[in-house]
């Protein structure tokens, strides 16, 4: 038996025996991309579409965290038959679009990159008027940003039994180890991730127990460079500090 | 969460309309996506039946077509099925699921038991 | 249609063995754009299908990393390396490159 089917969103018309292939779109991203914290990264995004020679009103869009639910970090839309993109959203202007979306491409530009955008994004593209339809990559492509250690906050806190011990916290990509050294230290205590802080950058060592008046050193290392910081512990009457 | 959840008659007498209803919360059915019906014949085979895009448009199963109707209510979020002149052969667990671009089934609905008898 | 075949019907096993199902359809399941929309499902019983394995080869979000899948044109496999409790129930492999979408017949895996 024959059947005809007239389908508007997809743009077909169709007279189908047995089976018929089903109108797809497609989307290629890579699987992650590599950038240094304060340069620019592209994210390519390229798609095909099952609607021949598409003119009408669409928008780019890309998110971020998660697909079709995550926040929207840029987004355009172009008019029938234009090739310009309007920006509508840009978060923090630090996004842009390199690629053109009448050509099927929505490579992305971000700019100035920290490493809080360190997470996978998605691109999504609709299509409106004649042609109602609609794409989201659901791998997305993953952005890693890459960045020397910096050492966040370093700090004298009171102790158990009128000791002190100190907090050094660091950032950084790959996670920094950090050593601690000071006052008949050897190199210090073990470097124990944050719980939670941050998106997994962030890198904690405690030192429990400062015994010695004098300067205390936190080093912070990964494969991109060092840094170090340091407190002074005085005891001024037996129980206070000053750093 | 998105969830999906049917609700039918239970029995149908053959030669009558079954009329299916399939609600979903935690996702606009006109947001994005297809969504599908699909049955579990006694015996655990599956058949596809067919959907309801977001656009509205629907593709049906061709051996299907002659009887089957999917249509929806966008202000109930619920999109539901109509099958005409049933027959024994139609009884069965009916499922609503969703679709996503990648041609997947992520979210399905428990199903709902349909007996068609005299 | 696309006549989608699985094998076998049913596979005993013990737990922590290895696994593996066939699916073999009737014609190709490539499109035109490149993916092959292959993905699979187990039904525990009273249950309603979930989903595994999509486009071949991607396992769904919180899927364990020992489910596999593999295969390309006409011919796909699942591979499970340990199997556990939770595993057991029926298989299915499904194909929605063409309408009308189509399901294989399943495969029960149970325990020896």
């Known amino acids: 038996f024959v059947r005809t089917k007239i389908d508007t969103t997809e743009n077909l018309l169709n007279t189908e025996v047995h089976s018929s292939p089903v109108q797809r779109w497609s989307m290629q991203v890579p699987a992650e991309v590599s950038a240094a914290a304060g340069d620019a990264a592209v994210l390519p995004c390229t798609f095909t579409h099952p609607h021949r020679h598409y003119d009408g009103p669409l928008t780019a869009i890309w998110r971020a965290g998660e697909p079709y639910a995550g926040p929207q970090v840029f987004r355009c839309a172009a008019a029938r038959g234009s090739e310009l993109c309007q920006t509508a959203l840009s978060l923090h202007g630090r996004f842009r679009l390199l690629g053109n979306p009448r050509r099927n491409d929505l490579s992305l530009r971000v700019e100035r990159l920290a490493l809080a955008d360190d997470r996978r994004y998605f691109c999504r593209v609709e299509f409106a008027g004649d042609v109602h339809d609609r794409y989201e990559s659901r791998h997305g492509v993953r952005l890693h940003v890459t960045a020397a250690p910096r050492i966040i906050n370093i700090s004298v806190l009171p102790g158990p039994a009128h000791a002190f011990r100190a907090l050094c916290t660091t950032e950084g990509e790959p996670p920094p180890a950090l050593a601690w050294s000071g006052p008949a230290l050897g190199n210090g205590s073990a470097a124990v991730p944050s719980s939670g802080q941050g998106h997994g950058h962030l890198v904690t060592a405690e030192l429990p127990a400062l015994n010695h008046d004098g300067r205390y050193t936190c080093t912070a290392a990964n494969s991109l460079g060092r840094s170090e910081a340091s407190v002074y512990l005085f005891r001024f009457h037996g129980a206070s500090a000053s750093t | 969460d998105v969830q999906l959840q049917e609700s039918g008659p239970g029995l149908v007498k053959p030669s009558q309309s079954l009329s299916l209803t399939c609600t979903v919360t935690g996702y606009s059915i006109t947001s994005d996506f297809a969504w599908n019906w699909i049955r579990q014949f006694p015996g655990n085979k599956l058949e596809w039946m067919g959907y309801?895009?977001?656009?509205?448009?629907?593709t049906y199963k061709p051996t299907l077509k002659s009887r089957i109707s999917i249509t929806r209510d966008t202000s109930k979020n619920q999109f539901f099925l109509q099958l005409n002149s049933v027959t024994t052969e139609d009884s069965a667990t009916y499922y609503c699921?969703?679709?996503?671009?990648?041609?997947?089934?992520?979210?399905w609905g428990q199903g709902t038991t349909l007996t068609v008898t005299s | 249609d696309v006549l989608m075949t699985q094998t076998p019907l049913s596979l005993p096993v013990s737990l922590g063995d290895h696994a593996s199902i066939s699916c073999r359809s009737s014609q190709t399941i490539l499109h035109s754009n490149g993916n092959t929309y292959l993905d699979w499902y187990l039904q525990k019983p009273g249950q309603s299908p979930k989903l595994l394995i999509y486009k071949v080869s991607n396992r769904f979000s919180g899927v364990p990393d020992r489910f596999s899948g593999s295969g390309s044109g006409t011919d796909f496999t699942l591979k499970i390396s340990r199997v556990e409790a939770e595993d057991l129930g029926v298989y299915y492999c499904?194909?929605?490159?063409?309408?009308?979408?189509?399901f294989g017949g399943g495969t029960k895996l149970e325990i020896k």
């Open positions: 309801i895009r977001f656009s509205g448009s629907t």
């Open positions: 699921a969703r679709e996503d671009y990648d041609g997947l089934f992520d979210y």
């Open positions: 499904f194909q929605g490159s063409h309408v009308p979408y189509t």
